[in-house]
Protein backbone atom coordinates (compact mmCIF):
# COMPACT_ATOMS: atom_id res chain seq x y z
CA UNK A 1 0.00 0.00 0.00
CA UNK A 2 1.47 3.35 -1.09
CA UNK A 3 0.49 6.98 -1.30
CA UNK A 4 0.17 8.01 -4.93
CA UNK A 5 -0.74 11.67 -4.34
CA UNK A 6 0.42 13.18 -1.05
CA UNK A 7 -2.10 14.80 1.31
CA UNK A 8 -2.98 18.41 0.63
CA UNK A 9 -4.93 20.31 3.25
CA UNK A 10 -7.02 23.46 3.54
CA UNK A 11 -8.29 25.13 6.70
CA UNK A 12 -11.49 27.04 7.33
CA UNK A 13 -9.46 29.02 9.91
CA UNK A 14 -11.94 28.20 12.58
CA UNK A 15 -12.37 24.58 13.56
CA UNK A 16 -11.87 22.24 10.60
CA UNK A 17 -9.05 21.47 8.21
CA UNK A 18 -9.70 19.10 5.33
CA UNK A 19 -6.97 16.88 3.89
CA UNK A 20 -7.25 14.87 0.68
CA UNK A 21 -4.91 12.33 -0.88
CA UNK A 22 -4.86 9.40 -3.29
CA UNK A 23 -3.62 5.87 -2.74
CA UNK A 24 -2.06 3.67 -5.41
CA UNK A 25 -5.15 1.49 -5.63
CA UNK A 26 -8.69 1.02 -4.30
CA UNK A 27 -8.62 1.53 -0.52
CA UNK A 28 -11.14 1.32 2.28
CA UNK A 29 -9.89 4.54 3.84
CA UNK A 30 -11.84 4.33 7.11
CA UNK A 31 -10.71 0.82 8.00
CA UNK A 32 -7.19 0.79 6.59
CA UNK A 33 -5.83 4.29 7.25
CA UNK A 34 -5.42 6.83 10.07
CA UNK A 35 -4.17 10.41 9.83
CA UNK A 36 -2.53 11.60 13.06
CA UNK A 37 -1.99 15.30 13.67
CA UNK A 38 -0.53 17.45 16.42
CA UNK A 39 0.86 20.94 16.93
CA UNK A 40 4.61 20.70 16.33
CA UNK A 41 5.64 22.07 19.72
CA UNK A 42 3.57 19.67 21.82
CA UNK A 43 4.61 16.35 23.31
CA UNK A 44 0.98 15.44 23.90
CA UNK A 45 -0.79 12.55 22.20
CA UNK A 46 -1.61 13.19 18.57
CA UNK A 47 -5.22 13.55 17.47
CA UNK A 48 -6.55 10.84 15.19
CA UNK A 49 -8.61 11.48 12.09
CA UNK A 50 -10.51 8.60 10.50
CA UNK A 51 -10.60 9.21 6.75
CA UNK A 52 -13.53 8.66 4.42
CA UNK A 53 -13.46 7.44 0.85
CA UNK A 54 -13.42 10.07 -1.87
CA UNK A 55 -13.59 8.02 -5.05
CA UNK A 56 -11.99 4.60 -5.48
CA UNK A 57 -8.42 5.42 -4.44
CA UNK A 58 -9.09 8.81 -2.89
CA UNK A 59 -9.37 9.60 0.82
CA UNK A 60 -10.51 12.69 2.70
CA UNK A 61 -10.10 13.53 6.38
CA UNK A 62 -11.67 16.33 8.41
CA UNK A 63 -9.27 17.42 11.15
CA UNK A 64 -10.95 19.01 14.15
CA UNK A 65 -9.08 21.90 15.76
CA UNK A 66 -9.87 23.87 18.93
CA UNK A 67 -9.13 27.14 17.21
CA UNK A 68 -6.51 28.44 14.84
CA UNK A 69 -3.84 31.13 15.13
CA UNK A 70 -1.39 32.21 12.48
CA UNK A 71 1.57 30.55 14.21
CA UNK A 72 0.02 27.08 14.19
CA UNK A 73 1.97 24.34 12.46
CA UNK A 74 0.88 20.70 12.58
CA UNK A 75 2.79 17.49 12.04
CA UNK A 76 0.83 15.01 9.93
CA UNK A 77 1.46 11.25 9.98
CA UNK A 78 -0.48 8.90 7.69
CA UNK A 79 -0.54 5.36 9.02
CA UNK A 80 -1.72 2.02 7.64
CA UNK A 81 -1.76 -0.11 10.76
CA UNK A 82 1.81 0.00 12.09
CA UNK A 83 3.25 1.24 8.80
CA UNK A 84 4.01 4.95 8.41
CA UNK A 85 3.08 5.76 4.81
CA UNK A 86 3.77 9.48 4.80
CA UNK A 87 4.96 12.23 7.12
CA UNK A 88 4.47 15.93 6.53
CA UNK A 89 3.41 19.21 8.04
CA UNK A 90 0.61 21.69 7.55
CA UNK A 91 0.33 25.36 8.48
CA UNK A 92 -3.38 26.27 8.41
CA UNK A 93 -2.82 30.01 7.97
CA UNK A 94 -1.00 29.36 4.69
CA UNK A 95 -3.79 27.22 3.22
CA UNK A 96 -7.09 28.90 4.04
CA UNK A 97 -10.36 28.25 2.29
CA UNK A 98 -13.03 30.33 4.03
CA UNK A 99 -16.40 28.96 5.01
CA UNK A 100 -19.20 29.74 2.59
CA UNK A 101 -21.50 32.65 3.47
CA UNK A 102 -25.05 31.68 4.44
CA UNK A 103 -28.61 32.97 4.64
CA UNK A 104 -28.55 34.70 1.27
CA UNK A 105 -31.75 36.72 0.95
CA UNK A 106 -33.04 38.94 -1.83
CA UNK A 107 -35.22 41.85 -0.71
CA UNK A 108 -37.34 43.05 -3.63
CA UNK A 109 -39.58 45.57 -1.89
CA UNK A 110 -37.19 48.54 -1.89
CA UNK A 111 -38.37 50.91 -4.67
CA UNK A 112 -36.89 49.29 -7.75
CA UNK A 113 -33.73 48.38 -5.90
CA UNK A 114 -32.66 44.84 -5.18
CA UNK A 115 -31.02 44.40 -1.80
CA UNK A 116 -29.08 41.16 -1.36
CA UNK A 117 -27.93 40.29 2.15
CA UNK A 118 -26.09 37.31 3.56
CA UNK A 119 -24.39 36.25 6.77
CA UNK A 120 -20.69 36.35 7.51
CA UNK A 121 -19.75 32.72 8.19
CA UNK A 122 -17.38 33.61 11.07
CA UNK A 123 -18.04 34.74 14.63
CA UNK A 124 -16.84 38.26 15.54
CA UNK A 125 -13.88 36.95 17.56
CA UNK A 126 -12.41 35.14 14.54
CA UNK A 127 -9.68 36.97 12.67
CA UNK A 128 -11.37 36.44 9.30
CA UNK A 129 -14.62 38.08 10.44
CA UNK A 130 -13.35 41.55 9.54
CA UNK A 131 -11.29 40.50 6.54
CA UNK A 132 -13.74 38.83 4.16
CA UNK A 133 -14.74 40.26 0.83
CA UNK A 134 -17.32 38.68 -1.42
CA UNK A 135 -18.35 37.88 -4.97
CA UNK A 136 -22.05 37.72 -5.81
CA UNK A 137 -23.10 35.72 -8.85
CA UNK A 138 -26.48 36.49 -10.41
CA UNK A 139 -27.82 34.59 -13.40
CA UNK A 140 -31.00 34.11 -15.35
CA UNK A 141 -32.66 30.72 -15.33
CA UNK A 142 -33.97 31.44 -18.82
CA UNK A 143 -30.88 32.83 -20.51
CA UNK A 144 -27.49 31.17 -19.81
CA UNK A 145 -25.74 34.20 -21.31
CA UNK A 146 -27.26 36.47 -18.67
CA UNK A 147 -24.64 35.74 -16.03
CA UNK A 148 -22.88 38.38 -13.96
CA UNK A 149 -20.47 38.72 -11.04
CA UNK A 150 -20.48 41.63 -8.59
CA UNK A 151 -17.38 42.08 -6.43
CA UNK A 152 -18.17 43.29 -2.92
CA UNK A 153 -14.92 44.76 -1.64
CA UNK A 154 -16.35 46.40 1.48
CA UNK A 155 -16.95 44.51 4.71
CA UNK A 156 -20.74 44.77 4.91
CA UNK A 157 -22.36 41.52 3.71
CA UNK A 158 -24.83 43.15 1.36
CA UNK A 159 -25.21 44.34 -2.21
CA UNK A 160 -27.62 46.87 -3.72
CA UNK A 161 -28.34 46.89 -7.42
CA UNK A 162 -31.01 48.58 -9.50
CA UNK A 163 -33.69 46.11 -10.51
CA UNK A 164 -33.57 47.65 -13.97
CA UNK A 165 -30.06 46.30 -14.55
CA UNK A 166 -31.73 42.92 -14.85
CA UNK A 167 -34.48 41.93 -17.23
CA UNK A 168 -38.01 42.31 -15.99
CA UNK A 169 -40.51 39.52 -15.80
CA UNK A 170 -38.09 36.63 -15.51
CA UNK A 171 -36.62 34.57 -12.70
CA UNK A 172 -33.06 35.02 -11.44
CA UNK A 173 -30.85 33.15 -9.04
CA UNK A 174 -28.04 34.47 -6.85
CA UNK A 175 -25.25 32.94 -4.82
CA UNK A 176 -22.31 34.38 -2.92
CA UNK A 177 -18.79 33.28 -1.99
CA UNK A 178 -16.01 34.77 0.14
CA UNK A 179 -12.25 35.19 0.28
CA UNK A 180 -9.73 37.02 2.47
CA UNK A 181 -6.85 38.92 0.92
CA UNK A 182 -4.90 39.01 4.20
CA UNK A 183 -4.17 35.28 4.05
CA UNK A 184 -4.28 35.05 0.26
CA UNK A 185 -7.03 32.47 0.64
CA UNK A 186 -8.75 30.52 -2.06
CA UNK A 187 -12.40 31.30 -2.68
CA UNK A 188 -14.94 29.63 -0.46
CA UNK A 189 -17.55 27.34 -1.94
CA UNK A 190 -20.63 29.11 -3.24
CA UNK A 191 -23.49 29.58 -0.83
CA UNK A 192 -26.76 27.82 -1.65
CA UNK A 193 -28.52 29.84 -4.31
CA UNK A 194 -31.73 31.77 -3.83
CA UNK A 195 -34.36 32.52 -6.48
CA UNK A 196 -36.62 35.50 -7.12
CA UNK A 197 -38.84 36.87 -9.84
CA UNK A 198 -37.54 40.17 -11.12
CA UNK A 199 -40.22 42.71 -11.91
CA UNK A 200 -40.11 46.47 -11.90
CA UNK A 201 -42.04 49.34 -13.42
CA UNK A 202 -40.63 50.42 -16.76
CA UNK A 203 -40.15 54.20 -16.78
CA UNK A 204 -42.81 55.97 -18.92
CA UNK A 205 -41.25 56.96 -22.23
CA UNK A 206 -42.30 60.28 -23.73
CA UNK A 207 -42.20 60.72 -27.53
Amino acid sequence: MKVLQEPTCVSDYMSISTCEWKMNGPTNCSTELRLLYQLVFLLSEAHTCIPENNGGAGCVCHLLMDDVVSADNYTLDLWAGQQLLWKGSFKPSEHVKPRAPGNLTVHTNVSDTLLLTWSNPYPPDNYLYNHLTYAVNIWSENDPADFRIYNVTYLEPSLRIAASTLKSGISYRARVRAWAQCYNTTWSEWSPSTKWHNSYREPFEQH
Epitope: L42, L43, S44, E45, A71, N73
Partner: antibody, heavy 117, light 107 residues
Protein backbone atom coordinates in the same frame (compact mmCIF):
# COMPACT_ATOMS: atom_id res chain seq x y z
CA UNK B 1 -11.87 21.24 36.50
CA UNK B 2 -8.14 20.71 35.96
CA UNK B 3 -6.14 20.33 39.17
CA UNK B 4 -2.42 19.83 39.67
CA UNK B 5 -1.16 19.30 43.21
CA UNK B 6 2.57 19.09 43.92
CA UNK B 7 4.05 17.38 46.97
CA UNK B 8 7.41 16.16 48.27
CA UNK B 9 9.15 19.48 48.86
CA UNK B 10 11.15 20.19 51.98
CA UNK B 11 14.57 21.00 53.39
CA UNK B 12 17.47 18.83 52.23
CA UNK B 13 21.25 18.97 52.47
CA UNK B 14 23.46 19.48 49.41
CA UNK B 15 24.26 16.21 47.67
CA UNK B 16 21.12 14.50 48.95
CA UNK B 17 18.03 13.45 47.02
CA UNK B 18 14.36 14.41 46.94
CA UNK B 19 11.41 13.14 44.93
CA UNK B 20 8.61 15.49 43.92
CA UNK B 21 5.20 14.31 42.80
CA UNK B 22 2.31 16.01 41.03
CA UNK B 23 -1.18 14.53 41.27
CA UNK B 24 -3.32 15.40 38.26
CA UNK B 25 -7.10 15.37 37.92
CA UNK B 26 -9.84 16.86 35.78
CA UNK B 27 -8.33 15.92 32.41
CA UNK B 28 -7.08 12.89 30.50
CA UNK B 29 -3.61 12.86 32.03
CA UNK B 30 -2.25 10.10 29.76
CA UNK B 31 -2.80 12.25 26.67
CA UNK B 32 -0.72 15.29 27.61
CA UNK B 33 2.91 16.29 27.85
CA UNK B 34 3.80 17.48 31.36
CA UNK B 35 6.45 19.91 32.57
CA UNK B 36 8.32 21.02 35.66
CA UNK B 37 9.11 24.72 36.07
CA UNK B 38 10.95 26.26 39.02
CA UNK B 39 11.42 29.67 40.59
CA UNK B 40 14.24 30.48 42.98
CA UNK B 41 13.31 32.90 45.79
CA UNK B 42 13.05 36.43 44.39
CA UNK B 43 14.11 35.23 40.92
CA UNK B 44 12.46 34.53 37.59
CA UNK B 45 10.81 31.45 36.14
CA UNK B 46 12.98 28.64 34.80
CA UNK B 47 11.75 25.68 32.77
CA UNK B 48 13.27 22.44 34.11
CA UNK B 49 12.01 19.36 32.27
CA UNK B 50 9.26 17.87 30.12
CA UNK B 51 7.97 14.37 29.49
CA UNK B 52 5.82 13.31 26.55
CA UNK B 53 2.35 11.86 27.03
CA UNK B 54 3.64 8.27 26.90
CA UNK B 55 6.99 8.84 28.60
CA UNK B 56 8.98 8.12 25.45
CA UNK B 57 10.52 11.59 25.14
CA UNK B 58 12.15 13.63 27.89
CA UNK B 59 14.03 16.92 27.77
CA UNK B 60 15.94 18.75 30.50
CA UNK B 61 17.63 22.06 31.09
CA UNK B 62 21.42 21.65 30.96
CA UNK B 63 21.97 22.47 34.64
CA UNK B 64 19.95 19.43 35.82
CA UNK B 65 20.89 16.87 33.16
CA UNK B 66 22.23 13.69 34.75
CA UNK B 67 20.93 14.71 38.19
CA UNK B 68 17.16 15.02 37.71
CA UNK B 69 14.85 12.43 36.17
CA UNK B 70 11.30 13.18 35.07
CA UNK B 71 8.84 10.27 34.97
CA UNK B 72 5.13 9.61 34.98
CA UNK B 73 2.66 6.92 36.00
CA UNK B 74 -0.34 7.21 33.71
CA UNK B 75 -2.25 4.57 35.66
CA UNK B 76 -2.06 6.79 38.75
CA UNK B 77 -2.25 10.19 37.00
CA UNK B 78 1.03 11.15 38.60
CA UNK B 79 4.06 13.13 37.40
CA UNK B 80 7.37 12.76 39.25
CA UNK B 81 10.70 14.52 39.45
CA UNK B 82 13.54 12.58 41.05
CA UNK B 83 16.21 15.06 42.13
CA UNK B 84 19.64 13.67 43.01
CA UNK B 85 22.91 15.39 43.95
CA UNK B 86 21.03 18.50 44.96
CA UNK B 87 22.86 21.81 44.97
CA UNK B 88 22.25 25.09 46.79
CA UNK B 89 21.15 26.66 43.48
CA UNK B 90 18.32 24.09 43.15
CA UNK B 91 16.48 25.89 45.96
CA UNK B 92 13.18 27.00 44.42
CA UNK B 93 9.45 26.59 44.27
CA UNK B 94 8.80 23.73 41.82
CA UNK B 95 5.64 23.88 39.72
CA UNK B 96 4.20 21.13 37.58
CA UNK B 97 2.40 22.33 34.48
CA UNK B 98 0.22 20.79 31.80
CA UNK B 99 1.04 21.69 28.23
CA UNK B 100 -1.57 23.02 25.85
CA UNK B 101 -1.92 24.92 22.62
CA UNK B 102 -0.52 28.06 24.25
CA UNK B 103 2.50 26.39 25.82
CA UNK B 104 1.52 25.89 29.46
CA UNK B 105 -2.22 26.01 30.09
CA UNK B 106 -2.48 24.88 33.73
CA UNK B 107 -0.10 25.17 36.68
CA UNK B 108 -0.01 23.63 40.13
CA UNK B 109 0.40 25.76 43.26
CA UNK B 110 4.03 24.71 43.66
CA UNK B 111 6.12 22.97 46.33
CA UNK B 112 9.16 24.56 47.97
CA UNK B 113 12.51 22.76 47.86
CA UNK B 114 15.19 24.22 50.11
CA UNK B 115 18.75 22.95 49.75
CA UNK B 116 20.72 24.06 52.79
CA UNK B 117 23.69 22.86 54.76
CA UNK C 1 19.24 26.99 23.53
CA UNK C 2 17.12 30.00 22.69
CA UNK C 3 17.78 33.03 24.92
CA UNK C 4 14.91 35.36 25.72
CA UNK C 5 15.83 38.93 26.67
CA UNK C 6 13.21 41.23 28.16
CA UNK C 7 13.42 44.99 28.52
CA UNK C 8 13.17 46.89 30.66
CA UNK C 9 13.88 44.73 33.71
CA UNK C 10 11.68 47.08 35.74
CA UNK C 11 9.57 50.15 35.16
CA UNK C 12 7.56 52.63 37.19
CA UNK C 13 4.21 53.74 35.85
CA UNK C 14 1.02 55.43 36.98
CA UNK C 15 -2.55 54.22 36.82
CA UNK C 16 -3.90 54.93 33.34
CA UNK C 17 -0.50 54.80 31.65
CA UNK C 18 0.15 52.82 28.50
CA UNK C 19 2.90 50.32 29.21
CA UNK C 20 5.04 48.44 26.68
CA UNK C 21 7.37 45.54 27.46
CA UNK C 22 9.61 44.03 24.80
CA UNK C 23 11.05 40.57 24.43
CA UNK C 24 13.77 39.51 22.00
CA UNK C 25 14.56 35.89 21.09
CA UNK C 26 18.08 34.86 20.10
CA UNK C 27 16.65 33.10 17.05
CA UNK C 28 13.37 32.90 15.16
CA UNK C 29 10.65 31.26 17.27
CA UNK C 30 7.82 31.13 14.71
CA UNK C 31 5.57 33.28 16.92
CA UNK C 32 5.48 30.55 19.57
CA UNK C 33 5.64 33.12 22.34
CA UNK C 34 3.58 33.41 25.52
CA UNK C 35 3.28 36.21 28.07
CA UNK C 36 2.64 35.57 31.76
CA UNK C 37 1.71 37.79 34.67
CA UNK C 38 2.85 36.87 38.18
CA UNK C 39 2.05 38.53 41.46
CA UNK C 40 4.11 37.88 44.61
CA UNK C 41 3.46 34.44 46.07
CA UNK C 42 1.08 33.53 43.25
CA UNK C 43 1.14 31.12 40.33
CA UNK C 44 1.93 32.63 36.90
CA UNK C 45 -1.14 33.54 34.88
CA UNK C 46 -1.17 33.17 31.10
CA UNK C 47 -2.14 36.36 29.23
CA UNK C 48 -1.14 35.81 25.59
CA UNK C 49 -0.16 32.84 23.45
CA UNK C 50 1.09 32.59 19.88
CA UNK C 51 2.49 36.13 20.23
CA UNK C 52 -0.83 37.91 19.86
CA UNK C 53 -3.73 35.63 20.83
CA UNK C 54 -5.46 36.65 24.05
CA UNK C 55 -6.09 33.85 26.51
CA UNK C 56 -9.75 33.27 27.34
CA UNK C 57 -10.91 35.53 30.17
CA UNK C 58 -8.02 37.98 29.87
CA UNK C 59 -9.14 41.62 29.47
CA UNK C 60 -8.56 43.28 26.11
CA UNK C 61 -6.36 45.98 27.64
CA UNK C 62 -3.59 43.38 27.21
CA UNK C 63 -2.30 42.89 23.69
CA UNK C 64 0.66 41.14 22.13
CA UNK C 65 2.40 41.79 18.85
CA UNK C 66 5.57 41.00 16.95
CA UNK C 67 7.03 38.22 14.85
CA UNK C 68 10.30 36.51 14.11
CA UNK C 69 12.50 37.48 17.06
CA UNK C 70 10.99 40.72 18.40
CA UNK C 71 7.80 40.79 20.45
CA UNK C 72 5.85 43.27 22.54
CA UNK C 73 3.32 43.14 25.37
CA UNK C 74 1.20 46.26 25.72
CA UNK C 75 -1.12 47.22 28.58
CA UNK C 76 -3.29 49.98 27.14
CA UNK C 77 -4.35 51.57 30.44
CA UNK C 78 -2.61 50.38 33.57
CA UNK C 79 -4.89 49.55 36.50
CA UNK C 80 -3.95 48.90 40.17
CA UNK C 81 -4.36 45.13 39.69
CA UNK C 82 -1.82 45.15 36.83
CA UNK C 83 1.20 45.92 39.01
CA UNK C 84 3.09 42.64 38.83
CA UNK C 85 6.01 40.93 37.11
CA UNK C 86 5.60 39.95 33.46
CA UNK C 87 7.48 37.15 31.70
CA UNK C 88 7.78 36.18 28.06
CA UNK C 89 8.40 32.54 27.19
CA UNK C 90 9.17 30.73 23.96
CA UNK C 91 7.79 27.27 23.26
CA UNK C 92 9.16 26.83 19.75
CA UNK C 93 11.82 24.32 20.77
CA UNK C 94 13.12 22.52 23.84
CA UNK C 95 14.33 23.65 26.24
CA UNK C 96 11.45 26.10 26.54
CA UNK C 97 12.88 29.32 27.95
CA UNK C 98 11.63 32.39 29.81
CA UNK C 99 12.73 35.98 29.75
CA UNK C 100 14.16 37.30 33.00
CA UNK C 101 10.98 39.22 33.80
CA UNK C 102 9.83 42.84 33.89
CA UNK C 103 8.60 44.24 37.20
CA UNK C 104 5.90 46.88 36.77
CA UNK C 105 5.81 49.11 39.86
CA UNK C 106 3.68 52.04 40.97
CA UNK C 107 5.27 55.43 40.33
Amino acid sequence: QVQLVESGGGVVQPGRSLRLSCAASGFTFRSYGMHWVRQAPGKGLEWVAVISYDGSNKYYIDSVKGRFTISRDNSKNTLNLQMNSLRLEDTAVYYCAKEGRGGFDYWGQGTLVTVSS
Amino acid sequence: DIQMTQSPSSLSASVGDRVTITCRASQVINNYLAWFQQKPGKVPKSLIHAASSLQSGVPSKFSGSGSGTDFTLTISSLQPEDFATYYCQQYNSHPWTFGQGTKVEIK
